[in-house]
Interface confidence: low
């Protein structure tokens, strides 16, 4: 039985040419992370193997970087990086948790969090 | 273990130039955005550069565009800074730094500028 | 360019004491982009709390961050020997990326 919980950035703004960090937190279960991909629609952009370490894609390399934790940093954002994240655990004996971040990227200086992530 | 170990440091007269050296190991140093940040005399942290993980971005404050220079080596898990036209207010200890926000700093070396 | 202002410059707490220090920005900046580093005597400086309220990995309990707008601030709920450092505050969205001028939290 899949007992845990991913909580996840939500909803989410930054402004054009800033960063994100991108954060989702598994809890209540204890089961093992194996690995965690990150995924932009139907796109790759890293993954965090337990045992391997990070692989970023290459095609987001100058982009994106692993961390804190877990989580990813989008970098020198554009209009076209709007839309959804996910995040998926792969656990063991779990099976699959996803997340779901959308992330818009504004013109405006006044981009700020519609909600924010806060580990428990 | 992540070490970040900082080179090149020293004594330079005004308008002098100097080239510091940050030998990374313990990670995929081509996966992260690296960066220098000194230290002041009055413990001042100040912000210096910033490189994209595959090198094809650099950013600097205004203070030192056009005088420094950040660069790196993927193959050889090496960062570098170039300072040149060197003033006294460039005194400070610069730390080679992992990531942004930065998570992992090395010890620092130490820069003089003076006659 | 954003301005980080931290008070006070420097305090002093007892053991058990509840320590708070604040970071004022210049003008309103996103809690996503508000982190702070703890940096002790002949040491480089820690990663300690990341995008206002997350801890870093390794951080006691005792260590709480919060704020929105253009006041942030870092609390510890009891203070301890070890907690006695330099707390720095830092903005980093766009370039420039700034510091505060750090706080000096001693022990009393």
């Known amino acids: 039985m899949m007992t845990g919980t991913i909580e996840t950035t939500g909803n989410i703004s930054a402004e054009k040419g800033g960063s994100i960090i991108l954060q989702c937190h598994l809890s209540s279960t204890t089961a093992q992370v194996t690995q965690v991909n990150w995924e932009q629609q139907d796109q790759l952009l890293a993954i965090c193997n337990a045992d391997l370490g990070w692989h970023i894609s290459p095609s987001f390399k100058d982009r994106v970087a692993p961390g804190p934790g877990l989580g990813l940093t989008l970098q020198s954002l554009t209009v076209n990086d709007t839309g959804e994240y996910f995040c998926i655990y792969h656990t063991y004996p779990d099976g699959t948790y996803t997340g779901r971040i959308f992330l818009e990227v504004l013109e405006s200086s006044v981009a700020e969090h519609g909600a924010r992530f806060q580990i428990p | 273990e992540v070490m970040l170990v900082e080179s090149g440091g020293g004594l330079v007269k005004p308008g002098g130039s100097l080239k510091l050296s940050c030998a990374a190991s313990g990670f995929t140093f081509s996966f992260y955005t690296m960066s220098w940040v000194r230290q002041t005399p009055e413990k001042r942290l100040e912000w210096v550069a910033t490189?994209?993980?595959?090198?094809?971005?650099?950013y600097y404050p205004d203070n030192v565009k056009g005088r420094f220079t950040i660069s790196r080596d993927n193959a050889k898990n090496n960062l570098y800074l170039q300072m040149s036209s060197l003033r006294s207010e460039d005194t400070a200890l610069y730390y080679c730094?992992?990531?942004?926000?930065?998570?992992?700093w090395g010890q620092g070396t130490t820069l003089t500028v003076s006659s | 360019q954003i301005v980080l202002t931290q008070s006070p410059a420097i305090m002093s707490a007892s053991l058990g004491e509840r320590v708070t220090m604040t970071c004022t920005a210049s003008?309103?900046?996103?809690?996503?982009?508000l982190h702070w580093y703890q940096q002790k005597p002949g040491s480089s400086p820690k990663f300690w709390i990341y995008?206002?309220?997350n801890m870093a990995s390794g951080v006691p309990a005792r260590f709480s961050g919060s704020g929105s707008g253009t006041s942030y601030s870092l609390t510890i709920s009891s203070m301890e020997a070890e907690d006695a450092a330099t707390y720095y505050c830092?903005?980093?969205?766009?370039?420039?990326?700034?510091f505060g001028g750090g706080t000096k939290l001693e022990i009393k």
């Open positions: 003008s309103s900046v996103s809690s996503t982009y």
């Open positions: 830092h903005y980093y969205h766009r370039s420039p990326y700034t």
């Open positions: 490189i994209s993980g595959g090198g094809g971005d650099t």
């Open positions: 730094a992992r990531s942004l926000p930065v998570d992992f």
């Open positions: 995008s206002t309220s």
